[in-house]
């Protein structure tokens, strides 16, 4: 990697999470600089030889990508000049977890930033009341989560409360045989109470909650990545 | 949405200094990494491109004007600065501001300065 | 300094017309090639960024290619409200430099 810039330039990344078998991002930037024909961006992976991409003179070079990352890999080209160096990954794998280097060179000088890349999958919640059940219960289902994740109840009225007694869980293997589907009922539930259901794993935290009143069902879920 | 608007002396004397200002309104100007610039087209002509800022300060002028521009940004006005020194005839065009990250995609309506004594 | 070349100069063209304008760079400029349309007394508008990405709200009549040196404009089926100045401009290395237009007029 020749240097040719006289300075260091500050060059930041973000820890992420890619979600397997969606596109992903991994997020590097570092200080504009106007000059496109100068500006060179590499990534690597620890333990790959080869990179993972190459952008330099205004376009991809990847001559030197290793195969692992054939046609996955994409910078955001018209956001270079403004100092946005992140990777676009397209159908992101479990094996794309890892350590990432950014390494920029710039007319202004050059630098890097490692990132932690962490791979699972994750999915939001639904939560839906089952008329089925002998007593009125509640349905917790997200489509894919990896690794296994824990799966806790809560409720704004019985704060602090242990539902563990009172609810089943269960985690049923998707066909790809990587991912599960997680399945949650809460039993005895009680009308104008407000239930959450929340799933968590090491690299996301997803949250359903449901308000169960005489004359109307309302429902909100979020999902929020964790970086440690 | 994002406007920009020129502002500044329609008529300015040989010699003396060109002064506009690019006010930005519907967004800040430091919200995200965007290189405010200045573009001119005289009377009948082309396009040019003057110079153009970053809210770091970092400036980036046109090599065939750059002993005679200053571009300055005041992020608390919402503000960017266009001087011209010593200016001729040449000088006249309409001034036009923009916003841009390696293509201009917003811009003010322009403001016509004439260089005449 | 990057020098953009336009062709041609003007045009004469009727609606419903398919149109091509063409603009050469000097040295390689990658695909860091934009097109404005400008119409008289307003301000120039983009169409077409990165030499082939349409920009939100343009029509889809617009398109761009081109890589390199060679950029091409297309517009597929000319509207009245198409008949402007058009400017191509790189943005590859500074100064950023504009072609010097090409006036598409009513035949």
């Known amino acids: 990697f020749g240097i040719s810039g006289k300075h260091f330039i500050t060059v930041t990344t973000f820890t992420s999470a890619g979600n397997i078998g969606e596109d992903g991002t991994l997020s590097c930037t570092f200080e504009p600089d106007i000059k496109l024909n100068g500006i060179v961006i590499q990534w690597l992976k620890e333990g790959i030889k080869g990179l993972v991409h190459e952008f330099k003179e205004g376009k991809d070079d990847l001559s030197q990508q290793h195969e692992m990352f054939r046609g996955r890999t994409a910078v955001f080209a018209d956001q270079v000049v403004v100092g946005n160096a992140s990777l676009r990954l397209k159908n992101v794998q479990l094996t794309d977890a890892g350590t990432y280097t950014c390494y920029i060179r710039t007319s202004k000088g050059k630098g890097n930033a490692n990132l932690e890349y962490k791979t699972g999958a994750f999915s939001m919640p639904e939560i839906n009341v089952d008329y089925n059940a002998s007593s009125e219960s509640l349905r917790c289902e997200a489509p894919r989560w990896f690794p296994q994740p824990t799966v806790a109840w809560a409720s704004q009225v019985d704060q602090g409360a242990n539902f563990s007694e009172v609810s089943n869980t269960s985690f049923e293997l998707n066909s790809e045989n990587v991912t599960m589907k997680v399945v949650s009922v809460l039993y005895n539930v009680t009308i104008n109470n407000t239930y959450s259901c929340m799933i968590e794993n090491d690299i996301a935290k997803a949250t359903g909650d449901i308000k169960v009143t005489d004359s109307e069902v309302k429902r909100r879920s979020q999902l929020q990545l964790l970086n440690s | 949405q994002l406007q920009l608007q020129e502002s500044g002396p329609g008529l300015v004397k040989p010699s003396e200094t060109l002064s506009l200002t690019c006010t930005v309104s519907g967004g800040s100007i430091s919200s995200s990494v965007y290189y405010w610039s200045w573009i001119r087209q005289p009377p009948g002509k082309g396009l040019e491109w003057i110079g153009s800022?970053?809210?770091?300060?970092?400036?980036y002028y046109n090599p065939s004007l750059k002993s005679r521009v200053t571009i300055s940004v005041d992020t608390s006005k919402n503000q960017f600065s266009l001087k011209l020194s010593s200016v001729t005839a040449a000088d006249t065009a309409v001034y036009y501001c923009?916003?841009?990250?390696?293509?201009?995609?917003?811009w003010g309506q322009g403001t016509m300065v004439i260089v005449s004594s | 300094d990057i020098q953009m070349t336009q062709s041609p100069s003007s045009l004469s063209a009727s609606v419903g017309d398919r149109v091509t304008i063409t603009c050469r760079a000097s040295?390689?400029?990658?695909?860091?090639l934009n097109w404005y349309q400008q119409k008289p007394g307003k301000a120039p508008k983009l169409l077409i960024y990165?030499?082939?990405s349409l920009q939100s709200g343009v029509p889809s009549r617009f398109s761009g290619s081109g890589s390199g040196t060679d950029f091409t404009l297309t517009i597929s089926s000319l509207q009245p409200e198409d008949f402007a100045t058009y400017y191509c401009?790189?943005?590859?290395?500074?100064?950023?430099?504009f072609g010097g237009g090409t006036k598409v007029e009513i035949k």
């Open positions: 923009a916003r841009a990250v390696s293509f201009l995609d917003v």
């Open positions: 401009q790189q943005s590859y290395d500074p100064p950023w430099t």
């Open positions: 990165g030499a082939s």
């Open positions: 040295q390689s400029i990658s695909s860091y």
């Open positions: 800022i970053l809210v770091s300060g970092s400036t």
